[in-house]
């Protein structure tokens, strides 16, 4: 049974040109975590494997960074970048957990961080 | 198994910069997050920065902003860290760390820096 | 940034004694590491993702915890455990450590 829940940073917002950090933490599980992906609707950004660390997708090499810890760094945002971004937590014995983030990319400057790690 | 072979000790003339150096080996050294944290005797241990090698992305924590800069050769497989405007409170011992987003699990052993006035 | 505090600096353990240490965080965070470092030496990762053993660590080590609030436990301490403990944290910018649990032998 899948008894883990995934927290993520839920929706946020990031001013255009700026950068903006991606997290989520699987929690209420003793699973051990083989790998994390990290998508963007259907493309995928990273992958960070137990064994052999992290895989940046060579389209997204100069704009995407590990980190911090299973994080992922997303820089020199656009517009373009507003949209629903997943990470994949791949687990044995329990299987796939998917967690969701919104983040939005605006022009001005208003831009307000949600809240860390709220349930989405 | 992965290795970090760090530079020896160093003893710096206050005011000057220092280079250190960590050699990795044993893994690909473009996969993995290279940390370094300093170690003194009354403060613990206090996270610096780290570099992605795969890109040279940097991550540094704002109390060492403009007085260390990381840096990557990836021919080479080496890490640096320089360290610069050298005063009494700079010495200390620097380790660097690996980290593929499980902490870090493979340690240098240590770069000591004495800094004489 | 957030602040870790480790309940003693310093701890005394009997062989065969249980041994429970904390680390407090200033805000909440999603995950605690843990350092074992003797003296002279590097660091070594002991205990990441707030329970989970690094490799080689013996099953008689545990960690647990939410929040703010961790711990990692020894269930029955043995000479060769006697050494610093440090907890860290990156659920925020920048990561920091704790100034560490130096755990002695009785």
């Known amino acids: 049974m899948m008894t883990g829940t995934i927290e993520t940073t839920g929706n946020i917002s990031a001013e255009k040109g700026g950068s903006i950090i991606l997290q989520c933490h699987l929690s209420s599980t003793t699973a051990q975590v083989t790998q994390v992906n990290w998508e963007q609707q259907d493309q995928l950004l990273a992958i960070c494997n137990a064994d052999l660390g992290w895989h940046i997708s060579p389209s997204f090499k100069d704009r995407v960074a590990p980190g911090p810890g299973l994080g992922l760094t997303l820089q020199s945002l656009t517009v373009n970048d507003t949209g629903e971004y997943f990470c994949i937590y791949h687990t044995y014995p329990d299987g796939t957990y998917t967690g969701r983030i919104f983040l939005e990319v605006l022009e001005s400057s208003v831009a307000e961080h949600g809240a860390r790690f709220q349930i989405p | 198994q992965a290795y970090l072979q760090q530079s020896g000790a160093e003893l710096v003339r206050s005011g000057a910069s220092v280079k250190m150096s960590c050699k990795a080996s044993?893994?690909?050294?473009?996969?993995?997050?290279l940390h370094w944290v300093k170690q003194t005797p009354g403060q613990g241990l206090k996270w610096i920065g780290y570099i992605y090698p795969g890109n040279g992305y940097t991550n540094y924590n704002q109390k060492f902003k403009g007085k260390a800069t990381l840096t990557a050769d990836t021919s080479s497989s080496t890490a640096y860290m320089q360290i610069n405007s050298l005063t009494s409170e700079d010495s200390a011992v620097y380790f660097c760390?690996?980290?593929?987003?499980?902490?870090?699990?493979?340690w240098g052993q240590g770069t000591s820096v004495t800094v004489s006035s | 940034q957030i602040v870790l505090t480790q309940s003693s600096a310093i701890m005394s353990a009997s062989p065969g004694e249980k041994v429970t240490m904390t680390c407090s965080a200033t805000?909440?965070?999603?995950?605690m590491h843990w350092y074992q470092q003797k003296s002279g030496t590097s660091p070594k990762r002991w205990i990441y993702d707030t329970s989970k053993l690094a490799s080689g660590v013996p099953a008689r080590f545990s960690g647990s915890g939410s929040g703010t609030s961790y711990s990692l436990t020894i269930s029955s301490m043995e000479a060769e455990d006697a050494a610093t403990y440090y907890c860290?944290?990156?659920?925020?910018?920048?990561?920091?450590f704790g100034a560490g649990t130096k755990l002695e032998l009785k």
């Open positions: 044993g893994y690909t050294f473009t996969s993995y997050n």
């Open positions: 760390a690996r980290e593929g987003g499980w902490a870090m699990d493979y």
């Open positions: 805000s909440s965070v999603s995950s």
């Open positions: 860290q944290q990156w659920s925020s910018n920048p990561s920091t």
